[in-house]
């Protein structure tokens, strides 16, 4: 990527944050070994990465969770990467699903999502999970980011 | 990315190598369908990718392993992507965890890690696992790489 | 990346398509929130991404599947990212393996593959799985793409 003002690097990597909120949208923070290249990408409300420039972005998320088959609903643990664009329908871009473990008290599993998508100016991406209380927030386990091609 | 001398592409993809060493750091080789773009990234001592230029890098690793719950410790299998920079603390950048399988003799599982990080000149990244003897080294199962944005 | 004619962005992201074919090669479609940057990368026969320009590419695939240990063969579910280049041997670039779940009727699991590879002009990449009937085709679960560095 060129480093000139015309075409600056745009990249972000944010770190999961435990939250008392009951929402299924994961919370993130600019803490630890995070990346925020410039103000052309921002973390808004601790939950979504919002971009100012239209273009192709590689967007990724990693979620580690700990769950047990007996203590969880029958449905698998699902992580979804979602897109909100001004004036457009909200979209699911990527999803991954893992059946709960039989390990006691819970079994850890990690999910990785990633793909190339066209984002509009002002578009926001965020991560949804079926049960945020099962997400692992230890160093490096759960993160979210993007880079502009 | 521009291909001029000013801003050459920097990328690497190396292939896992079985090792008799008892260390938890995985060993890699420039073999098979590997990538080493130029000498601005090098594989050092078969275990770490070292970069010469400061900048944002997308770094990734994939580890496939085969383990059994009864034969393994109670702790899950954890793969960690770690960073060593001159003059700085060693850091865990990313981790993923998978509980051992109940399949016999062992159950295979794959972990993928990836994220965007700022690297200093001379920084090295490497991959740690809880039990290297469980790692699968068949073609394509376990690999490690990076690309400079 | 420069946006001039000299060095246009090349990227693709395609969406899984259920198929009645018995082949182990997964089928893809330009549907939903797909990406096809230009004609320098194309989806051929619904099964392979073919590039016109030589260079380094980050190639990735995500496969979600639902399987049961009793109903499946003893071998794990394996997803392979493969390369076909004119005049060269077909290569396995990346593989991931997950042992089947004991959940009934089946347990969902997701696999992510990704790496940097040198592709020749006319090279094609495709995704193989051990049992395509187990693949999940719900929105966002299974996808395949690449981006040129």
């Amino acid at each position: 990527m060129q480093k000139g003002d015309q075409n600056p690097q745009i990249a972000a990597h944010v770190i999961s944050e435990a939250s008392s909120k009951t929402t299924s949208v994961l919370q993130w923070a600019e803490k630890g070994y995070y990346t925020m290249s410039n103000n052309l990408v921002t973390l808004e409300n601790g939950k979504q990465l919002t971009v100012k420039r239209q273009g192709l972005y590689y967007i990724y998320a990693q979620v580690t969770f700990c769950s047990n088959r007996e203590a969880s609903s029958q449905a698998p643990f699902i992580a979804s990467l979602c897109l909100k664009s001004p004036g457009r329908f909200e979209r699911i871009l990527l999803r991954a699903a893992n059946t709960h473990s039989s390990a006691k008290p819970c079994g850890q599993q990690s999910i990785h999502l990633g793909g190339v998508f066209e984002l509009q100016p002002g578009a926001s991406v965020f991560v949804n999970v079926t049960d945020p209380s099962q997400v692992s927030h230890g160093t490096g386990f759960t993160s979210f980011g993007l880079l502009k091609l | 990315m521009q291909k001029g001398d000013q801003n050459p592409q920097i990328a690497a993809h190396v292939i896992s190598e079985a090792s008799s060493k008892t260390t938890s750091v995985l060993q890699w080789a420039e073999k098979g369908y590997y990538t080493m773009s130029n000498n601005l990234v090098t594989l050092e001592n078969g275990k770490q990718l070292t970069v010469k230029r400061q900048g944002l890098y997308y770094i990734y690793a994939q580890v496939t392993f085969c383990s059994n719950r009864e034969a393994s410790s109670q702790a899950p299998f954890i793969a960690s992507l770690c960073l060593k920079s001159p003059g700085r603390f060693e850091r865990i950048l990313l981790r993923a965890a998978n509980t051992h399988s109940s399949a016999k003799p062992c159950g295979q599982q794959s972990i993928h890690l990836g994220g965007v990080f700022e690297l200093q000149p001379g920084a090295s990244v490497f991959v740690n696992v809880t039990d290297p003897s469980q790692v699968s080294h068949g073609t394509g199962f376990t690999s490690f790489g990076l690309l400079k944005l | 990346m420069q946006k001039g004619d000299q060095n246009p962005q090349i990227a693709a992201h395609v969406i899984s398509e259920a198929s009645s074919k018995t082949t182990s090669v997964l089928q893809w479609a330009e549907k939903g929130y797909y990406t096809m940057s230009n004609n320098l990368v194309t989806l051929e026969n619904g099964k392979q991404l073919t590039v016109k320009r030589q260079g380094l590419y980050y190639i990735y695939a995500q496969v979600t599947f639902c399987s049961n240990r009793e109903a499946s063969s003893q071998a794990p579910f394996i997803a392979s990212l493969c390369l076909k280049s004119p005049g060269r041997f077909e290569r396995i670039l990346l593989r991931a393996a997950n042992t089947h779940s004991s959940a009934k009727p089946c347990g969902q699991q997701s696999i992510h593959l990704g790496g940097v590879f040198e592709l020749q002009p006319g090279a094609s990449v495709f995704v193989n799985v051990t049992d395509p009937s187990q693949v999940s085709h719900g929105t966002g679960f299974t996808s395949f793409g690449l981006l040129k560095l």
Epitope: G32 | E44, N45, K52, K84, P86, G87, Q120, P121, G122 | -
Partner: antibody
Amino acid sequence: EVQLVESGGGSVKPGGSLKLSCAASGFTFSDHYMYWVRQTPEKRLEWVAIISGGGSYTSYPDSMKGRFTISRDNAKNILHLQMSSLKSEDTAMYYCTRESNGKPGFAYWGQGTLVTVSA
Amino acid sequence: DIELTQSPTSLAVSLGQRATISCKASQSVDYAGDSYMNWYQQKPGQPPKLLIYAASNLESGIPARFSASGSGTDFTLNIHPVEEEDAATYYCQQSYEDPWTFGGGTKLEIK
């Protein structure tokens, strides 16, 4: 126990060359960045060079670039500093140093070897 | 390059009292939640000895009377209570970025 022992110092005329060595023991040599640091007669400390564990990365301050070359022999656990086009301001005690495991700061130092550049 | 300015250049402190040495950096040495400032002690005829790493962490084997604090550009080394054996020259050093630089040193004399 970590040990670093420098050798190769001595007197040399301006424009001359000298090769310093540092024998390392008590740790896995190839796992560590290694450094040279010098101390001038006025007791000022100056970083001289760094080399990565495998030797692929090296760096120097601008005033020493092109004149000094750091290298290592991981098979023999030896660190080298080749110095050429020496100037009187290069007169100093030269120390071989190493950081602690995974932590910043030069935790291990040799006893030093004295280099005197004088006509 | 990051310049480090130490003050005072020398000080004399009575046995059992507190010695305070300051180090100012020409730019911040903070990164990812850590401050990359280290402190050393050097006695005549010996190499420097690491006392404190990353602004406030006591190196193994160093007595607890040594402490340090600071972030960004302003850092302080404290010795309390000062003992006879603490007579030495003290240096700060930044390991935030290459070229690694040292302060000019502070000579501590015990009264």
